[in-house]
Amino acid sequence: LTCLGGFASPGPVPPSTALRELIEELVNITQNQKAPLCNGSMVWSINLTAGMYCAALESLINVSGCSAIEKTQRMLSGFCPHKVSAGQFSSLHVRDTKIEVAQFVKDLLLHLKKLFREGQFN
């Protein structure tokens, strides 16, 4: 079960539903972006491979005081089996490359849409 209870969903949901809702939240962010997202904050780029949900959370969790991505952070924590805290990094980070949060969100969205279309929900 994908348990996002207490984070964004009303309780445990199927993996496909959780991924669908995460995609929609990222679409929301990209559609509603007016000023630079999170004041143009930079985050570590990640490899969009297995374990990317934790890697994405590890990267985004270092952005503080940005309400626009708080829901995304909570949703990502539902996909990541371990607790993630600021300053924590995995081997999935491309540690020599930082990108703007807006670009990070766009890249993540494109990849998640591809996974969704291909039926890769877990």
């Epitope: 079960l1 496909s16 669908r20 809702e21 679409v27």
Partner: antibody, heavy 118, light 107 residues
Framework: EVQLQESGPGLVKPSETLSLTCTVS????????WNWIRQPPGKGLEYMGY???????YYNPSLKSQITISRDTSKNQLSLKLSSVTAADTAVYYC????????????WGQGTTVTVSS | DIQMTQSPSSLSASVGDRVTITCHAS??????LSWYQQKPGKAPKLLIY???DLHTGVPSRFSGSGSGTDFTLTISSLQPEDFATYYC?????????FGGGTKVEIK
Amino acid sequence: EVQLQESGPGLVKPSETLSLTCTVSGGSISSDYWNWIRQPPGKGLEYMGYISYNGNTYYNPSLKSQITISRDTSKNQLSLKLSSVTAADTAVYYCARLAKWTWYFDIWGQGTTVTVSS
Amino acid sequence: DIQMTQSPSSLSASVGDRVTITCHASQNINVWLSWYQQKPGKAPKLLIYKASDLHTGVPSRFSGSGSGTDFTLTISSLQPEDFATYYCQQGQSYPYTFGGGTKVEIK
């Protein structure tokens, strides 16, 4: 109470494009997910795809080259276009709502019958 | 795609009978299964979701059970308005898929 009403031509010629509209009343298409499901005569139900509250779409891969789902928020309508139709596309077409964070269809339109024939 | 197989495809029963319909998924779908009732010329109506949760307004004579790959819809005491076709649907993964249906007819 949310209600759905499908409309469109009952007869479409082979190789042409089938176009249907679903009008949503009592709720906004800018929330939840709006789906198309079809049922060939005497057969079971086939899931076709959705358009989300953001306008994001998903299509069943079996129909991907044929199908387009779009919306008109000013009219609170969604539409289905199915290109290059054949007799196999003859069916009752339903629109149905799927609420956020759910995976089941809680509200359905009454359906509209489309026959593909020359 | 996940294949959903219902059995039987049709059955005859009398008012007051206990009726059981089964649905088998081609892979594990946990409890992400719903049941619908469809009457001739009408749209399907949601009866049960999450394998056993009754949708609002559905009579308590309907119940669902199962998890993983095997599921059951039970009507404890068949009423005249229950003669219809019943479909299961999986919500584990897209594209969502339905069973072939079980037609409950009057004996």
